[in-house]
């Protein structure tokens, strides 16, 4: 064996955003015929000799960063990419609004404003159906997400979350959905 074994993948099902009280399973997937898996939680570092972790009831203490590796013979794989498991619903939901309006003519600009009842400094915007998210660190109670030159692709349902950078894996409940309609 020359060099480390390829890294496995670590995924959360159904999602890595988990409302408090709900269940989630983390699963480490390596190549076929893996001898043994190790699943680690970081900060503080601890580990289990399993290829999965079932969390029946999401709690604040479950939130954080996870990674996994596997062993074949006496060789270890590279570690998986880290998975950030987020507990949502820890704080009250922010409000999400569109300015000047949630009905926007194509080619115009619109700003989605996420506003929290708390003095949080981090905000995240999700669009339904998209895999990525838009993070914006801001100071105090609000964050603006400008969308320049709107196209039909921007149509859809948006939600935002707020949290404190000092507890980056403990998020608010999601805002009520905002439907952005691109006209013309």
């Amino acid at each position: 064996q020359s060099g480390p074994l390829p890294k496995p993948s670590l995924q959360a099902q159904p999602s890595s955003l988990v409302p408090l009280g709900q269940s989630v399973i983390l699963r480490c997937q390596g190549p076929p015929d893996v001898d043994l898996y190790r699943l680690e939680k970081l900060k503080p570092e601890k580990y289990e000799d399993q290829d999965f972790l079932f969390i029946p009831t999401m709690e604040r203490s479950n939130a954080g960063r996870y990674r996994c590796s596997y062993q074949n013979g006496s060789h270890w794989s590279l570690p998986s990419d880290q998975l950030e498991l987020i507990a949502t619903g820890v704080y009250a939901k922010p409000s999400l609004s569109a300015h000047p309006s949630s009905a926007v003519p194509q080619g115009r600009d619109v700003t989605l404003k996420c506003q929290s009842p708390y003095s949080f400094d981090e905000f995240v915007l999700y669009k339904e159906g998209d895999t990525g998210s838009y993070k914006r660190p801001e100071k105090w109670y609000r964050a603006n997400f400008p969308i320049i030159t709107v196209t039909a692709a921007h149509s859809g349902t948006y939600r935002c979350y707020s949290f404190s950078s000092s507890s980056p894996y403990l998020w608010s409940a999601p805002s009520d959905p905002l439907v952005l309609v691109v006209t013309g």
Epitope: K43, E45, Q71
Partner: antibody, heavy 123, light 112 residues
Amino acid sequence: QVQLVESGGGLVKPGGSLRLSCAASGFSFSDHYMSWIRQAPGKGLEWVSSVGSEGKFIDYAASVKGRFTISRDNAKNSLYLQMNSLRAEDTAVYYCARHYREFRWHYYYFDYWGQGTLVTVSS
Amino acid sequence: QSVLTQPPSVSGAPGQRVTISCTGSSSNIGAGYDVHWYQQLPGTAPKLLIYGNSNRPSGVPDRFSGSKSGTSASLAITGLQAEDEADYYCQSHDLGAHVWVFGGGTKLTVLG
């Protein structure tokens, strides 16, 4: 209270073999990872080998891989280290150490150590 | 050659403050792994002194404290006492081969 007692050390010629034992008491032995750590005379600590709570996960330091074998018998609350093809540089006090565990999780540090057993490899 | 680097010796007078450094790399301390510290009094087995960078097991005086930043860590001892004279070892974990790694040890001498 937690107790770890090593035995089996002694004088052995280069190329010879020795089997160390560690008798554990005062805790649920089968729940914990266990390790052997050694200390050459006047030198620092060197991790030698670890074994998972069920005996499946096994890791060795590069300096002993292929010569030493770690094992455990949870029914007897015992940890073992079979040392073959011994060399002068294996001369050391060998400590048995318990890894901390909390709930389902194992941690990467040693919360209890035995008093050690001396292995001398010399012709 | 130890994976983690510590100064071979430090010294201080009773009542003084001393620090012991422990430097690792991107595959151990820098990979996010915690640093733990052990005290070995002359002729005895090592004893856990600090775990998880800065936590003290019960029975360890608050004169002992630990911290970690980037790829290094340090142990501080304030109000030095004669009974603190011992060898001190840092320990972490290495991600590359999942092995446990130690520093070479630091001999603390309490002067006078």
